[in-house]
Amino acid sequence: MMTGTIETTGNISAEKGGSIILQCHLSSTTAQVTQVNWEQQDQLLAICNADLGWHISPSFKDRVAPGPGLGLTLQSLTVNDTGEYFCIYHTYPDGTYTGRIFLEVLESSVAEHGARFQIP
């Protein structure tokens, strides 16, 4: 039975040319986190594996940095980076937990962070 919940940074915004940290946190479960995958829509950005560390997709290696922790840092943001991002927690024995973050990249210098929210 899956009892965990994923807390994410929710809806966030950032300036064009800047950087942003995407973070998720899995709580309320004793399941072992085997791996966390980060995806943008249907593209794999990066994987953090408990034993083998980070794997960054070749097409994103210049703009994606691992961490902090199981999070992901996106750099040199463009308007095209606006969209949905997913953290996919592969756990044992629970299975898979998925969190969603919506990032809006703004042309202006005003970019505010949204509130956190939880996904069961």
């Epitope: 995958n37 794999l44 594996n49 034993d51 794997h55 024995p93």
Partner: antibody
Framework: QVQLVQSGAEVKKPGASVKVSCKAS????????IHWVRQAPGQGLEWMGW????????GYAQNFQGRVTMTRDTSITTAYMELSRLRSDDTAVYYC???????????????WGQGTTVTVSS | DIEMTQAPSSLSASVGDRVTITCRAS??????LNWYQQKPGKAPKLLIY???SLQNGVPSRFSGSVSGTDFTLTISSLQPEDFATYYC?????????FGGGTKVGIR
């Protein structure tokens, strides 16, 4: 070349245990997870679980929980799958397979052993 | 567990035919879908990973696509060496599960 070579066929009686080996060569053994998959005669593929050669961490399918044990010996680049309390419906070909690209799940199983036939019969 | 429903279970085709095999997941698996080819007495061979990425060394006549939870393997022009059984496999959540297989035979 990259390959996984499995131990030979086994015939076992119901209630016994079997231990199948999977010898890896041609790549860094500790860099890739190993899965075990079985196939009963004339049937489809059934995933049993995985082992991390790096840490020895394992993840088993619920169907096999309590009956299967996956281990590895990094000094001889070999993974093992032991199945206990064998029943006649455990008769199958057992495969080891490498998870591609040094991570789990996303890239599929790209290198497979030749299979080990395990027959359970009284 | 995520159930993978593969169709058809078997089909007959001729060399040069376009062949389509479908696989439906019982819940979302995003793009975590792999396709394998298996010939009698042999181990499976990875053809497609992540729904549509061609594994190294696999001929370009094989392709994969996805729409929601429906996945498709297409062989654009069937060759004699393609007569085999094909399996889909989801790797989104454990336990990893396979479709029941599609046997492609000679018409």
């Amino acid at each position: 070349q990259v390959q996984l070579v499995q131990s030979g066929a086994e015939v076992k009686k119901p209630g016994a245990s079997v231990k199948v080996s999977c010898k890896a060569s041609g790549y860094t053994f500790t860099g890739y997870y190993i899965h075990w998959v079985r196939q009963a005669p004339g049937q489809g593929l059934e995933w049993m679980g995985w082992i991390s050669p790096t840490s020895g961490a394992t993840g088993y399918a619920q169907n096999f929980q309590g009956r299967v044990t996956m281990t590895r010996d990094t000094s001889i680049t070999t993974a093992y799958m032991e199945l206990s309390r064998l029943r006649s419906d455990d008769t199958a070909v057992y495969y080891c397979a490498r998870d591609s690209n040094s991570v789990l799940y996303y890239y599929g199983m790209d290198v497979w052993g030749q299979g080990t036939t395990v027959t359970v019969s009284s | 567990d995520i159930e993978m429903t593969q169709a058809p279970s078997s089909l007959s085709a001729s060399v040069g035919d376009r062949v389509t095999i479908t696989c439906r997941a019982s819940q979302t698996i995003r793009r975590y879908l792999n396709w394998y080819q298996q010939k009698p007495g042999k181990a499976p061979k990875l053809l497609i990973y992540a729904a549509s990425s061609l594994q190294n060394g696999v001929p370009s006549r094989f392709s994969g696509s996805v729409s929601g939870t429906d996945f498709t393997l297409t062989i654009s022009s069937l060759q004699p060496e393609d007569f085999a059984t094909y399996y889909c496999q989801q790797s989104y959540s454990t336990p990893l599960t396979f479709g029941g297989g599609t046997k492609v035979g000679i018409r």
